[in-house]
């Protein structure tokens, strides 16, 4: 293995080593450590934990482990006014209240500093009015309510459903709709799994529990105060009013009992279908407003959190290459909690952890990678990826010049099913690769290697006999690595049968009954997944350290472009005769593509030939291979979001979890034939397949030979 | 119809033991929380704990740790409370009620 | 523990009144108190639940109101039936705890 090559290595020292040394009792300890007490960002608890984590990474023999604070903005709720919904009879009263908070879990009740349910950066206010259920809050949701069915939002409140997308897209969607003030509840269509128990029986979401969150639309700004630039001392910040991505309207989350009570007496319009439908015993009526009987009432939200420039902490750890010391692989992930963190961040964090401990042993007996390892403890990632993004600000030109790969490490699991991988496609191979190397921990698959469940549970739609790997999109630590920076990005973890179970991420995600004993007792009891996940993170980084020819592969990049190309074609295919009328060619894209397959064929070819004992031609070619992604980046970035720079991947602007290929061109033609001036809108088409077309052939030059 | 059936009151000497019962009908038995309360004669009401048939698990008021015992027989679907060392401070009425859930109020009741 | 104090602990009133009974919690509850009722040889009845839903074949002349630390049970147009010993209970923190009662009598 191309690993074992690595210098000062004995044969002792390979990955083997290195997988060996993780263990599944160790993940399990620090799980408990870090779930005790809540990790808010921002707060002094957290700092302490950071403070922690800098000693432990020390201990684990790290040759360096630095706190990088900075002053962002954060939101919280006012700790002697709560934030709550009532309805109110004509007279004004309040004859029904929401929840102040959940209810606490067995074993939790004297804990202090859990922060209520909050939608995090809602302003202010205490609108009334009547209420208008709008499904998903999705753009297609609102289409319907608008076109179709002839439902007005403006001046109303609207009540969505969490799921099927990023909640700050709801928001966004809410307050194009007029909106003023959005309830956001969880519905047990999407968080109770039939057949399974609520906290503290099984993994279901309680009546009583809500999702906490961030409602902000950054799109990759990091501190809304300060985009582009750290937020450091010297800072220069902007003014409230002209932050980046914050909501005009008052935003907060419910449980499934309070929902109840608001929906339970909607009247106006019915559902327009059954997808509009949950699982609660109410009629789904659309509205606006109550009901005959109660249609004198309305809802009144009462929100008063506050905004607050805060000190965040990332804990920065570094174990120096041997060779390459100036080339950085980089493990990451979040350390804030919206409480506990049991899950997110916790389970990943405590992954990390591991990994550290295990390349500190194999450091204090003589070993070093090729390259740089960089380790990261992420702070203020709920509250809109603020840690990772202001470091990398801080770093960036370090990072565009000297950034190979950066591996993401938020939650190790969101089920127990399968392996689940989002990347870029260079890492395809990497990851095929080191699964078939690693043991299945799945029941039925004693024996098989974890490449074989995968497949078996997870089959890639295209290729038969291969795993699903998925486009990175956003709503993680990665986002401003990959999208602004162009640095090859891979994430990994467990998940559920997304089949099967067709309820948003998991049920307890962001409430306070995401606790260690959620893991412990439901989740992983052998910590057997976490484990896995802890070989899926730790080998990618260490054979991209490690190897002497990075493994990228760039004729995977090749086959996607192609599959992309032909997808965009197809969307604007729907439109023959406005092509037809605007001139629009996709030709000058297809072309590329062609163009970087033959040329990515040529540079992996020699690849093979190359001589690796000569070390500047050996970094030519790595270097070739680590400015792939780079070359991806358009410094002009995408219309109307600059800090979303790639060309082939970006966060949908539908859905920010989602990614979108080819977003330049896939945002120009959606919608299209609803623009009010058609000429201008399929301009806009030409001009962005201008730009994908010149990217990819550019990118296509950089893999040729040199001279 | 859902129906709490209590065992009937008992004369016992100080120091020995007693096990009360509630056999419960109309539900699935596992799939509901049994709580036991103390009421002193005339007086406010007193929650002892929890059995949660569908996992054994039980929880008790730190007031009756050691005083009473929970316990289930899933295939009567009745749930029982031990209370030893008997003292007159124990003299009291005891009721069985239901709960959904953890977090649920009890909505059924023996008698 | 969470203490709950329920007052008034006596109250006498006359069919089609409308009554209220308090109770207070010695830190926040939320919304998660419930109020019961209590008839000499019958089993106890749930009337209320998270401070304000009414539990399902109870008359809804039974409302309850209140978050926080402060709760109310309104009787709207007493019925003959209601007059009984009523108690509220906090059902959002272990060990689960009662107030002292109220006993309603005809006046």
């Known amino acids: 293995k191309s690993s074992n090559e690595a210098t000062n290595i004995t044969p002792k020292h390979n990955m083997k080593a290195f997988l060996d040394e993780l263990k599944a009792e160790n993940i399990k300890k620090f799980l408990y450590n870090f779930t005790q007490i809540p990790h808010l960002a921002g707060t002094e608890q957290n700092f302490q934990l950071a403070k922690q984590i800098q000693s432990q990474w020390k201990e684990f023999g790290l040759d360096s482990v630095e706190l990088a604070h900075y002053d962002v903005l954060l939101s919280y709720p006012n700790k002697t006014h709560p934030n709550y919904i009532s309805i109110i009879n004509e007279d004004g009263n309040e004859i029904f209240n929401t929840s102040l908070f959940e209810p606490p879990p067995p074993g939790y009740e004297n804990v202090s500093d859990i922060v209520p349910p909050f939608s995090a950066f809602s302003p202010q206010g205490m609108p009334e009015g009547d209420l208008v259920y709008v499904n998903y809050a999705r753009t297609e949701d609102f289409f319907k309510l608008e076109r179709d069915m002839k439902i007005n939002c403006s001046g109303k409140i609207v009540i969505a459903r969490y799921g099927k997308v990023f909640r700050g897209n709801k928001v966004k969607n809410a307050q194009l709709a007029g909106a003023k003030g959005v309830i956001l509840y969880s519905d047990p269509a999407d968080y109770f799994a039939p057949g399974v128990k609520s906290y503290p029986d099984g993994w279901n979401l309680p009546g009583g529990g809500v999702q906490r969150g961030n409602i902000l639309n950054l799109n990759g700004a990091g501190d809304p105060l300060t985009p582009g630039y750290p937020a450091n001392e010297y800072a220069y910040r902007r003014g409230i009013a002209e932050a980046v991505g914050l909501p005009s309207i008052p935003v907060h989350p419910i449980g499934y009992y309070d929902a109840q009570k608001l929906l339970e007496k909607m009247g106006g319009s019915a559902p327009p279908d059954s997808s509009w439908r949950g699982s609660l015993k109410v009629p789904y009526n659309v509205g606006p407003g109550f009901t005959g009987n109660f249609s004198t009432q309305k809802v009144k939200m009462h929100i008063h959190s506050t905004n607050e420039v805060t000190r965040i902490y990332n804990v920065i750890g570094t174990l120096r290459g041997a060779v390459e010391p100036d080339r950085y692989v980089i493990l990451g992930g979040h350390r804030d909690s919206w409480v506990f963190g049991g899950i997110d961040p916790q389970s990943g964090a405590a992954v990390v952890h591991e990994i550290v401990r295990s390349f500190g042993t194999l450091k204090k007996e003589g070993w070093r990678p090729r390259r740089t390892i960089l380790f990261a403890s992420w702070d203020a990632e709920e509250f809109g990826l603020l840690g990772s993004t202001e470091w990398a600000e801080e770093n960036s030109r370090l990072l565009q010049e000297r950034g190979v790969a950066y591996i993401n490490a938020d939650s190790s699991i969101e089920g127990n099913y399968t392996l689940r991988v989002d990347c870029t496609p260079l890492m395809y191979s990497l990851v095929h690769n080191l699964t078939k190397e690693l043991k299945s921990p799945d029941e039925g698959f004693e024996g098989k290697s974890l490449y074989e469940s995968w497949t078996k549970k997870s089959p890639s739609p295209e290729f038969s006999g291969m795993p699903r790997i998925s486009k990175l999109g956003s709503g993680n630590d990665f986002e401003v690595f990959f999208q602004r920076l162009g640095i090859a990005s891979g994430r990994a973890r467990y998940t559920k049968n997304w089949e099967t179970n067709k309820f948003s991420g998991y049920p307890l995600y962001h409430s306070v009954y995401e606790t260690y004993e959620l893991v412990e007792k439901f989740y992983d009891p052998m910590f057997k997944y976490h484990l896995t996940v802890a070989q899926v993170r730790g080998g990618m980084v260490f054979e991209l350290a490690n190897s002497i020819v990075l493994p990228f592969d760039c004729r995977d990049y090749a086959v996607v472009l192609r599959k992309y190309a032909d997808k965009i074609y197809s969307i604007s295919m729907k439109h023959p005769q406005e092509m037809k009328t605007y001139s629009v060619s996709f030709d000058s894209l297809f072309s590329a593509v062609k163009n970087f397959t033959e040329i990515a064929s040529k540079f992996s070819e020699r690849l093979q030939d190359f001589d690796k004992s000569n070390p500047i031609v050996l970094r030519m070619m790595n270097d070739q291979l680590m400015f792939l992604e780079r070359a991806f980046i358009d410094p002009l970035g995408l219309p109307d979001r600059p800090f979303y720079r790639h060309v082939i991947y970006a966060p949908s602007s539908h859905n920010k979890y989602a990614g979108e290929s080819f977003p330049g061109i896939y945002d120009a033609l959606f919608d299209i034939e609803s623009k009010v001036d058609p000429s201008k809108a399929w301009g806009e088409v030409k001009r962005q397949i201008y730009v994908a077309a010149f990217t990819v052939q550019a990118a296509a030059e950089t893999l040729s030979e040199v001279a | 119809e859902i129906q709490l059936q209590q065992s009937g009151p008992e004369l016992v000497k100080p120091g020995a033991s007693v096990k009360m019962s509630c056999k419960a009908s109309g539900y699935t038995f596992t799939d509901y929380y049994m709580h036991w309360v103390k009421q002193n004669n005339g007086e406010s009401l007193e929650w002892i704990g929890y059995?949660?048939?569908?996992?054994?698990?039980?929880r008790y008021n730190q007031n009756f740790n050691g005083k009473a015992t929970l316990t289930v027989d899933k295939s009567s679907s009745t749930a029982y409370m031990q209370l030893n060392s008997l003292t007159s401070e124990d003299s009291a009425f005891y009721y069985c009620?239901?709960?959904?859930g953890y977090y649920d109020a009890m909505d059924y009741w023996g008698q | 523990d969470v203490q709950i104090t329920q007052s008034p602990s006596y109250l006498a009133a006359s069919p089609g009144e409308t009554i209220t009974i308090n109770c207070r919690a010695s830190k926040s509850i939320s919304k998660y108190l419930a109020w019961y009722q209590e008839k000499p040889g019958k089993a106890n009845k749930l009337l209320i639940h998270s401070g304000s839903t009414l539990q399902s074949g109870i008359p809804s002349r039974f409302s309850g109101s209140g978050s926080g630390t402060d709760f109310t049970l309104t009787i709207s147009s007493l019925e003959p039936e209601d007059f009984a010993m009523y108690y509220c209970q906090q059902h959002i923190e272990y060990p689960w705890t009662f107030g002292g009662g109220t006993k309603l009598e005809i006046k």
């Open positions: 059995f949660n048939p569908y996992n054994d698990y039980t």
């Open positions: 009620a239901r709960s959904d």
